[in-house]
Interface confidence: medium
Protein backbone atom coordinates (compact mmCIF):
# COMPACT_ATOMS: atom_id res chain seq x y z
CA UNK A 1 0.00 0.00 0.00
CA UNK A 2 1.24 3.61 -0.70
CA UNK A 3 1.08 6.16 1.54
CA UNK A 4 2.60 10.60 2.23
CA UNK A 5 5.02 10.61 4.41
CA UNK A 6 5.53 13.71 6.82
CA UNK A 7 4.79 16.86 6.74
CA UNK A 8 8.40 18.08 6.49
CA UNK A 9 9.75 21.08 5.73
CA UNK A 10 10.06 22.01 1.88
CA UNK A 11 13.01 19.43 0.31
CA UNK A 12 13.47 17.70 3.38
CA UNK A 13 14.06 14.05 2.97
CA UNK A 14 10.90 12.06 5.15
CA UNK A 15 11.41 8.52 6.24
CA UNK A 16 8.89 6.45 8.56
CA UNK A 17 7.42 10.05 8.98
CA UNK A 18 10.89 11.63 10.09
CA UNK A 19 12.00 14.60 8.25
CA UNK A 20 15.40 14.25 7.61
CA UNK A 21 17.94 17.32 5.57
CA UNK A 22 21.93 16.92 4.96
CA UNK A 23 23.35 20.26 5.12
CA UNK A 24 26.92 21.45 3.25
CA UNK A 25 27.62 24.01 4.96
CA UNK A 26 30.39 23.27 7.57
CA UNK A 27 29.94 24.96 11.39
CA UNK A 28 30.71 24.17 14.54
CA UNK A 29 28.59 22.42 16.39
CA UNK A 30 26.88 25.10 18.13
CA UNK A 31 26.46 26.83 14.93
CA UNK A 32 24.45 23.39 13.37
CA UNK A 33 22.52 23.44 16.31
CA UNK A 34 21.10 26.83 15.68
CA UNK A 35 20.72 26.21 11.73
CA UNK A 36 18.39 22.94 12.60
CA UNK A 37 16.80 25.34 15.51
CA UNK A 38 15.70 28.27 12.82
CA UNK A 39 14.17 25.48 10.83
CA UNK A 40 12.26 24.26 13.33
CA UNK A 41 14.45 20.88 13.71
CA UNK A 42 17.13 19.66 16.14
CA UNK A 43 20.08 17.87 15.24
CA UNK A 44 19.94 14.14 14.20
CA UNK A 45 19.01 12.18 17.06
CA UNK A 46 19.74 8.26 16.50
CA UNK A 47 16.89 6.62 18.25
CA UNK A 48 16.19 3.53 16.45
CA UNK A 49 18.85 1.60 13.81
CA UNK A 50 15.20 -0.18 12.58
CA UNK A 51 13.50 3.29 12.07
CA UNK A 52 16.40 4.95 10.82
CA UNK A 53 17.79 2.21 8.46
CA UNK A 54 18.49 5.01 5.45
CA UNK A 55 21.74 6.51 8.08
CA UNK A 56 23.51 3.23 7.35
CA UNK A 57 24.09 4.57 3.98
CA UNK A 58 24.96 8.08 4.81
CA UNK A 59 28.67 8.50 3.30
CA UNK A 60 31.19 10.92 5.55
CA UNK A 61 30.41 12.81 8.84
CA UNK A 62 28.12 14.57 10.11
CA UNK A 63 27.49 16.44 13.28
CA UNK A 64 24.22 15.05 15.28
CA UNK A 65 22.60 16.29 18.36
CA UNK A 66 24.93 13.97 20.74
CA UNK A 67 27.34 15.69 23.63
CA UNK A 68 29.67 14.64 26.59
CA UNK A 69 28.46 15.13 29.78
CA UNK A 70 31.22 15.76 31.90
CA UNK A 71 29.52 16.10 34.84
CA UNK A 72 28.10 12.82 35.13
CA UNK A 73 30.26 11.04 32.03
CA UNK A 74 26.94 10.32 30.18
CA UNK A 75 26.76 11.28 26.36
CA UNK A 76 23.08 12.51 25.44
CA UNK A 77 21.23 14.13 22.94
CA UNK A 78 19.94 17.93 22.84
CA UNK A 79 16.54 17.07 24.62
CA UNK A 80 18.45 15.10 27.41
CA UNK A 81 17.88 11.49 26.96
CA UNK A 82 20.85 9.22 27.31
CA UNK A 83 22.60 7.51 24.40
CA UNK A 84 21.28 4.11 24.49
CA UNK A 85 23.28 1.29 24.66
CA UNK A 86 24.82 -0.45 21.46
CA UNK A 87 22.61 1.99 19.32
CA UNK A 88 26.15 3.60 18.14
CA UNK A 89 29.70 2.41 17.83
CA UNK A 90 31.39 6.03 19.96
CA UNK A 91 34.85 5.98 18.37
CA UNK A 92 37.63 8.31 20.05
CA UNK A 93 38.68 10.48 16.44
CA UNK A 94 39.59 13.73 18.63
CA UNK A 95 39.44 14.62 22.40
CA UNK A 96 35.92 16.14 22.44
CA UNK A 97 32.41 16.56 23.66
CA UNK A 98 30.52 16.57 20.48
CA UNK A 99 29.54 13.79 18.13
CA UNK A 100 30.10 13.15 14.40
CA UNK A 101 27.76 10.57 12.95
CA UNK A 102 29.26 8.28 10.47
CA UNK A 103 27.90 5.28 8.49
CA UNK A 104 26.79 2.34 9.75
CA UNK A 105 26.23 3.38 13.16
CA UNK A 106 28.83 5.27 13.94
CA UNK A 107 29.67 8.10 16.28
CA UNK A 108 32.89 9.93 16.04
CA UNK A 109 34.13 11.98 18.84
CA UNK A 110 35.16 15.27 18.07
CA UNK A 111 36.14 18.94 19.14
CA UNK A 112 32.66 20.75 19.28
CA UNK A 113 34.34 24.00 18.00
CA UNK A 114 35.67 21.94 14.75
CA UNK A 115 33.54 22.92 11.72
CA UNK A 116 31.90 19.83 9.93
CA UNK A 117 28.87 19.33 8.32
CA UNK A 118 25.61 18.38 9.73
CA UNK A 119 22.44 16.41 9.87
CA UNK A 120 18.99 17.98 10.43
CA UNK A 121 16.02 16.17 11.78
CA UNK A 122 12.53 17.14 13.01
CA UNK A 123 10.21 14.05 14.12
CA UNK A 124 6.25 14.47 12.66
CA UNK B 1 5.87 25.53 4.69
CA UNK B 2 5.72 21.89 5.01
CA UNK B 3 4.21 19.81 3.16
CA UNK B 4 3.56 15.95 2.52
CA UNK B 5 5.90 13.58 0.15
CA UNK B 6 4.53 10.67 -1.90
CA UNK B 7 2.97 9.11 -2.14
CA UNK B 8 5.20 6.39 -1.72
CA UNK B 9 5.17 2.22 -1.18
CA UNK B 10 5.26 1.73 2.70
CA UNK B 11 8.49 2.48 4.36
CA UNK B 12 10.19 4.13 1.04
CA UNK B 13 12.25 7.14 1.34
CA UNK B 14 10.58 10.20 -0.18
CA UNK B 15 12.04 13.11 -1.43
CA UNK B 16 10.94 16.13 -3.65
CA UNK B 17 7.90 13.65 -4.55
CA UNK B 18 10.17 10.73 -5.47
CA UNK B 19 10.22 7.41 -3.97
CA UNK B 20 13.59 5.43 -2.96
CA UNK B 21 14.23 2.03 -1.64
CA UNK B 22 18.07 0.99 -0.95
CA UNK B 23 18.03 -3.13 -1.15
CA UNK B 24 20.26 -4.89 1.07
CA UNK B 25 20.22 -8.33 -0.88
CA UNK B 26 22.91 -8.83 -3.66
CA UNK B 27 21.18 -9.32 -7.13
CA UNK B 28 22.63 -9.49 -10.71
CA UNK B 29 21.27 -6.55 -12.74
CA UNK B 30 18.45 -8.44 -14.25
CA UNK B 31 17.47 -10.13 -10.82
CA UNK B 32 17.68 -5.94 -9.36
CA UNK B 33 15.66 -4.67 -12.07
CA UNK B 34 12.93 -7.51 -11.61
CA UNK B 35 12.68 -7.06 -7.88
CA UNK B 36 11.82 -3.26 -8.28
CA UNK B 37 9.44 -4.18 -11.43
CA UNK B 38 7.99 -6.51 -8.63
CA UNK B 39 7.36 -3.11 -6.72
CA UNK B 40 5.59 -1.29 -8.97
CA UNK B 41 9.63 0.92 -9.47
CA UNK B 42 12.44 0.67 -11.60
CA UNK B 43 15.54 0.89 -10.94
CA UNK B 44 17.14 4.73 -9.92
CA UNK B 45 17.15 6.46 -12.80
CA UNK B 46 19.45 9.92 -12.50
CA UNK B 47 17.88 13.26 -13.76
CA UNK B 48 18.47 15.84 -12.10
CA UNK B 49 21.69 16.54 -9.24
CA UNK B 50 19.04 19.00 -7.95
CA UNK B 51 16.29 17.36 -7.78
CA UNK B 52 18.25 13.84 -6.73
CA UNK B 53 20.80 15.97 -4.39
CA UNK B 54 20.39 13.30 -2.18
CA UNK B 55 22.26 10.65 -4.20
CA UNK B 56 25.36 12.44 -3.60
CA UNK B 57 25.68 11.04 0.24
CA UNK B 58 25.31 7.57 -0.37
CA UNK B 59 27.76 5.55 -0.11
CA UNK B 60 28.61 1.73 -1.60
CA UNK B 61 27.96 0.75 -5.17
CA UNK B 62 24.43 -0.07 -6.28
CA UNK B 63 22.69 -0.86 -9.86
CA UNK B 64 20.70 1.69 -11.03
CA UNK B 65 19.02 1.06 -14.12
CA UNK B 66 21.67 2.67 -16.67
CA UNK B 67 22.43 0.15 -19.52
CA UNK B 68 25.13 0.15 -22.32
CA UNK B 69 23.37 -0.48 -25.40
CA UNK B 70 26.66 -2.03 -27.68
CA UNK B 71 25.04 -1.18 -31.13
CA UNK B 72 25.01 2.07 -30.66
CA UNK B 73 27.48 3.02 -27.94
CA UNK B 74 25.38 5.03 -26.01
CA UNK B 75 24.49 4.43 -22.13
CA UNK B 76 20.78 4.87 -21.48
CA UNK B 77 18.44 4.28 -18.91
CA UNK B 78 15.33 1.06 -19.02
CA UNK B 79 12.37 3.48 -20.13
CA UNK B 80 14.75 4.26 -23.48
CA UNK B 81 16.30 7.85 -22.90
CA UNK B 82 19.43 8.82 -22.96
CA UNK B 83 21.81 9.30 -20.20
CA UNK B 84 22.16 13.85 -20.38
CA UNK B 85 25.61 14.78 -20.28
CA UNK B 86 26.97 15.89 -17.66
CA UNK B 87 25.06 13.76 -15.02
CA UNK B 88 26.65 11.24 -14.01
CA UNK B 89 31.04 10.89 -14.24
CA UNK B 90 30.95 7.26 -15.95
CA UNK B 91 34.51 4.77 -14.90
CA UNK B 92 34.80 1.71 -15.99
CA UNK B 93 35.66 -0.47 -13.09
CA UNK B 94 34.94 -3.48 -14.86
CA UNK B 95 34.21 -4.41 -18.83
CA UNK B 96 30.30 -4.63 -19.28
CA UNK B 97 27.22 -3.31 -20.16
CA UNK B 98 25.57 -2.67 -16.70
CA UNK B 99 26.38 0.31 -14.04
CA UNK B 100 26.51 1.19 -10.80
CA UNK B 101 25.50 4.38 -9.03
CA UNK B 102 28.19 5.54 -6.23
CA UNK B 103 28.41 8.49 -4.16
CA UNK B 104 28.48 12.31 -5.95
CA UNK B 105 26.96 11.14 -9.19
CA UNK B 106 29.89 8.40 -10.33
CA UNK B 107 28.23 5.41 -12.46
CA UNK B 108 30.57 2.46 -12.27
CA UNK B 109 30.56 0.22 -15.00
CA UNK B 110 29.74 -3.63 -14.20
CA UNK B 111 28.98 -6.81 -15.52
CA UNK B 112 25.34 -7.22 -15.56
CA UNK B 113 25.84 -10.94 -14.08
CA UNK B 114 27.55 -9.53 -10.68
CA UNK B 115 25.86 -9.03 -7.38
CA UNK B 116 25.14 -5.86 -5.89
CA UNK B 117 22.87 -4.28 -3.45
CA UNK B 118 20.56 -1.87 -5.91
CA UNK B 119 18.27 1.28 -5.73
CA UNK B 120 14.84 1.23 -6.81
CA UNK B 121 12.96 4.36 -7.36
CA UNK B 122 9.48 5.49 -7.93
CA UNK B 123 8.06 8.66 -9.35
CA UNK B 124 5.00 9.88 -8.33
CA UNK C 1 32.34 38.64 35.21
CA UNK C 2 30.64 39.62 31.22
CA UNK C 3 28.93 42.49 30.77
CA UNK C 4 27.85 44.19 27.86
CA UNK C 5 26.95 48.02 27.11
CA UNK C 6 24.18 49.12 23.72
CA UNK C 7 25.85 52.83 22.25
CA UNK C 8 24.38 54.41 19.35
CA UNK C 9 22.21 57.04 18.64
CA UNK C 10 18.65 57.90 20.58
CA UNK C 11 16.95 59.66 17.97
CA UNK C 12 16.79 57.80 14.18
CA UNK C 13 14.22 59.56 11.63
CA UNK C 14 11.80 57.50 9.56
CA UNK C 15 13.30 55.72 6.39
CA UNK C 16 17.09 56.17 8.11
CA UNK C 17 19.00 53.17 9.21
CA UNK C 18 19.33 52.82 13.07
CA UNK C 19 22.80 51.68 14.01
CA UNK C 20 23.79 50.25 17.47
CA UNK C 21 26.83 48.76 18.43
CA UNK C 22 27.46 46.55 21.85
CA UNK C 23 31.11 46.09 23.40
CA UNK C 24 31.34 43.15 25.16
CA UNK C 25 33.97 43.00 28.38
CA UNK C 26 35.07 40.76 30.87
CA UNK C 27 35.41 38.11 28.37
CA UNK C 28 35.81 37.15 24.60
CA UNK C 29 33.16 37.63 21.96
CA UNK C 30 35.05 34.86 19.79
CA UNK C 31 34.57 32.22 22.12
CA UNK C 32 32.89 29.30 19.48
CA UNK C 33 30.20 27.91 21.89
CA UNK C 34 28.68 31.55 22.29
CA UNK C 35 26.38 33.88 20.22
CA UNK C 36 25.31 37.44 20.92
CA UNK C 37 21.28 38.40 20.82
CA UNK C 38 19.81 41.61 19.86
CA UNK C 39 16.24 41.98 21.76
CA UNK C 40 14.13 45.19 21.66
CA UNK C 41 11.28 45.91 24.09
CA UNK C 42 7.98 48.20 22.75
CA UNK C 43 5.16 49.17 24.45
CA UNK C 44 3.20 47.88 21.64
CA UNK C 45 4.75 44.28 20.92
CA UNK C 46 6.77 43.31 24.05
CA UNK C 47 10.12 41.73 23.80
CA UNK C 48 11.27 40.67 20.57
CA UNK C 49 13.83 38.40 19.25
CA UNK C 50 15.59 40.36 16.33
CA UNK C 51 18.48 38.17 15.73
CA UNK C 52 21.64 36.77 16.73
CA UNK C 53 25.50 35.85 15.84
CA UNK C 54 28.60 34.29 16.19
CA UNK C 55 31.88 35.05 16.20
CA UNK C 56 32.03 33.26 13.22
CA UNK C 57 29.69 36.06 11.07
CA UNK C 58 27.33 33.18 10.65
CA UNK C 59 23.54 34.96 11.47
CA UNK C 60 19.74 33.95 12.54
CA UNK C 61 17.25 36.63 12.13
CA UNK C 62 13.76 36.60 12.88
CA UNK C 63 11.80 36.41 9.93
CA UNK C 64 9.58 39.59 10.51
CA UNK C 65 12.54 42.12 10.79
CA UNK C 66 15.17 39.95 8.17
CA UNK C 67 14.87 41.84 4.99
CA UNK C 68 15.80 44.81 7.14
CA UNK C 69 18.33 43.62 9.49
CA UNK C 70 22.11 42.77 9.85
CA UNK C 71 24.31 41.95 12.60
CA UNK C 72 27.98 42.08 12.43
CA UNK C 73 30.99 41.55 14.70
CA UNK C 74 34.18 42.34 14.92
CA UNK C 75 36.06 40.45 16.82
CA UNK C 76 39.15 42.64 16.85
CA UNK C 77 37.34 45.14 18.99
CA UNK C 78 34.86 42.64 21.10
CA UNK C 79 31.99 44.10 19.64
CA UNK C 80 28.99 43.24 17.61
CA UNK C 81 26.50 45.66 15.91
CA UNK C 82 22.95 45.93 14.46
CA UNK C 83 21.67 47.82 11.83
CA UNK C 84 18.28 48.11 10.78
CA UNK C 85 16.80 49.67 8.08
CA UNK C 86 14.47 51.67 6.73
CA UNK C 87 12.69 52.44 10.28
CA UNK C 88 9.35 53.57 11.25
CA UNK C 89 7.54 54.66 14.16
CA UNK C 90 7.05 51.07 15.40
CA UNK C 91 10.61 50.50 15.36
CA UNK C 92 10.46 52.80 18.40
CA UNK C 93 11.91 50.71 21.33
CA UNK C 94 14.27 50.06 24.14
CA UNK C 95 17.18 48.01 22.73
CA UNK C 96 19.33 45.37 24.22
CA UNK C 97 22.28 43.12 23.53
CA UNK C 98 22.66 39.87 25.31
CA UNK C 99 23.97 36.43 26.26
CA UNK C 100 22.08 33.42 26.12
CA UNK C 101 22.73 30.75 29.29
CA UNK C 102 24.63 27.87 27.48
CA UNK C 103 24.63 24.82 29.69
CA UNK C 104 25.06 21.08 28.67
CA UNK C 105 25.08 22.34 24.78
CA UNK C 106 21.98 24.13 25.04
CA UNK C 107 20.57 27.63 25.31
CA UNK C 108 18.48 28.28 28.20
CA UNK C 109 17.39 32.06 27.95
CA UNK C 110 19.43 34.64 28.20
CA UNK C 111 21.25 35.84 31.19
CA UNK C 112 23.29 38.26 30.24
CA UNK C 113 21.83 41.94 29.54
CA UNK C 114 22.74 45.67 28.28
CA UNK C 115 21.50 48.11 29.94
CA UNK C 116 19.20 48.53 27.28
CA UNK C 117 18.98 51.88 25.07
CA UNK C 118 16.31 53.77 24.10
CA UNK C 119 15.87 54.78 20.02
CA UNK C 120 13.00 56.70 19.02
CA UNK C 121 12.12 57.51 15.63
CA UNK C 122 10.68 60.91 14.58
CA UNK C 123 11.28 63.32 12.13
CA UNK D 1 6.14 31.07 14.91
CA UNK D 2 5.01 29.57 17.97
CA UNK D 3 3.30 31.90 20.35
CA UNK D 4 3.06 32.23 24.05
CA UNK D 5 -0.15 33.15 25.76
CA UNK D 6 0.21 34.60 29.33
CA UNK D 7 -2.42 34.44 32.18
CA UNK D 8 -3.58 36.35 33.74
CA UNK D 9 -1.94 39.68 32.46
CA UNK D 10 -2.65 41.28 35.39
CA UNK D 11 -2.50 40.34 38.71
CA UNK D 12 -3.43 42.62 42.35
CA UNK D 13 -2.23 40.84 45.03
CA UNK D 14 -0.74 40.92 48.68
CA UNK D 15 2.63 39.99 50.43
CA UNK D 16 2.68 37.02 51.70
CA UNK D 17 0.12 35.27 48.78
CA UNK D 18 0.53 32.63 46.98
CA UNK D 19 1.05 33.82 43.15
CA UNK D 20 0.50 31.42 39.95
CA UNK D 21 0.81 32.68 36.64
CA UNK D 22 0.34 30.26 33.90
CA UNK D 23 1.99 30.69 30.10
CA UNK D 24 0.87 28.65 26.95
CA UNK D 25 2.36 27.86 23.98
CA UNK D 26 0.87 27.55 20.41
CA UNK D 27 2.54 23.91 19.83
CA UNK D 28 4.82 21.65 22.09
CA UNK D 29 8.70 22.85 23.52
CA UNK D 30 9.50 20.32 25.73
CA UNK D 31 11.01 22.26 28.55
CA UNK D 32 12.71 24.67 26.62
CA UNK D 33 10.83 27.67 28.44
CA UNK D 34 12.28 30.73 30.48
CA UNK D 35 10.91 32.73 33.10
CA UNK D 36 12.16 36.58 33.75
CA UNK D 37 11.33 39.06 36.06
CA UNK D 38 11.38 42.70 35.09
CA UNK D 39 11.11 45.68 37.15
CA UNK D 40 10.87 49.24 35.90
CA UNK D 41 13.74 50.44 33.74
CA UNK D 42 15.81 47.77 33.99
CA UNK D 43 16.76 44.53 31.61
CA UNK D 44 14.78 41.59 32.25
CA UNK D 45 16.33 39.01 34.62
CA UNK D 46 16.73 35.16 33.88
CA UNK D 47 14.50 33.25 36.83
CA UNK D 48 13.86 30.01 35.43
CA UNK D 49 15.39 27.42 33.10
CA UNK D 50 14.67 25.15 31.23
CA UNK D 51 11.01 25.12 32.91
CA UNK D 52 12.10 23.84 36.18
CA UNK D 53 15.63 24.97 36.94
CA UNK D 54 16.20 27.88 39.29
CA UNK D 55 18.90 29.91 38.49
CA UNK D 56 21.81 30.75 41.13
CA UNK D 57 20.89 33.22 43.45
CA UNK D 58 17.07 33.15 42.41
CA UNK D 59 14.96 33.16 46.05
CA UNK D 60 13.65 29.50 46.35
CA UNK D 61 9.81 30.72 46.62
CA UNK D 62 9.75 30.70 42.94
CA UNK D 63 9.60 27.74 41.52
CA UNK D 64 8.72 26.63 37.88
CA UNK D 65 7.01 23.40 36.43
CA UNK D 66 4.95 22.17 32.75
CA UNK D 67 6.45 20.54 29.53
CA UNK D 68 4.55 20.69 26.19
CA UNK D 69 2.42 23.20 26.15
CA UNK D 70 1.36 24.26 30.09
CA UNK D 71 3.86 25.76 32.30
CA UNK D 72 3.59 27.73 35.40
CA UNK D 73 5.33 30.08 37.42
CA UNK D 74 4.54 29.98 40.93
CA UNK D 75 6.07 32.47 43.60
CA UNK D 76 5.09 30.51 47.09
CA UNK D 77 4.68 33.77 49.05
CA UNK D 78 5.11 37.21 47.67
CA UNK D 79 7.67 39.81 48.89
CA UNK D 80 7.70 43.09 48.51
CA UNK D 81 10.04 42.85 46.06
CA UNK D 82 8.71 40.63 43.66
CA UNK D 83 6.06 43.29 42.42
CA UNK D 84 7.04 43.29 38.55
CA UNK D 85 6.22 41.95 35.55
CA UNK D 86 7.04 38.49 34.39
CA UNK D 87 7.52 37.25 30.37
CA UNK D 88 7.87 33.52 29.96
CA UNK D 89 10.11 33.20 26.36
CA UNK D 90 10.45 29.69 24.34
CA UNK D 91 13.68 28.31 23.50
CA UNK D 92 12.45 25.03 21.40
CA UNK D 93 12.83 27.04 17.61
CA UNK D 94 13.99 30.07 16.32
CA UNK D 95 12.49 32.63 16.43
CA UNK D 96 12.75 32.97 20.10
CA UNK D 97 9.55 34.55 21.33
CA UNK D 98 8.13 36.04 24.44
CA UNK D 99 4.80 36.16 26.08
CA UNK D 100 3.15 39.75 26.40
CA UNK D 101 3.98 39.64 30.26
CA UNK D 102 2.12 39.68 33.37
CA UNK D 103 2.26 42.40 35.25
CA UNK D 104 2.03 41.75 39.02
CA UNK D 105 1.15 44.63 41.49
CA UNK D 106 0.24 45.70 45.19
CA UNK D 107 -3.06 44.86 46.05
Known amino acids: TESYCGPCPKNWICYKNNCYQFFDESKNWYESQASCMSQNASLLKVYSKEDQDLLKLVKSYHWMGLVHIPTNGSWQWEDGSILSPNLLTIIEMQKGDCALYASSFKGYIENCSTPNTYICMQRT | TESYCGPCPKNWICYKNNCYQFFDESKNWYESQASCMSQNASLLKVYSKEDQDLLKLVKSYHWMGLVHIPTNGSWQWEDGSILSPNLLTIIEMQKGDCALYASSFKGYIENCSTPNTYICMQRT | QLQLQESGPGLVKPSETLSLTCTVSGGSISSSSYYWVWIRQSPGKGLEWIGNIYSSGSTHYNPSLKSRVIISVDTSKNQFSLKLKSVTAADTAVYYCAKPLLRDYYYYGVDVWGQGTTVTVSS | DIQLTPSPSFLSASVGDRVTITCRASQAISSYLAWYQQKPGKAPKLLISPASTLQSGVPSRFSGSGSGTEFTLTISSLQPEDFATYFC?????????FGQGTKVEIK
Open chain 4, 89 to 97: QQLNSFPWT
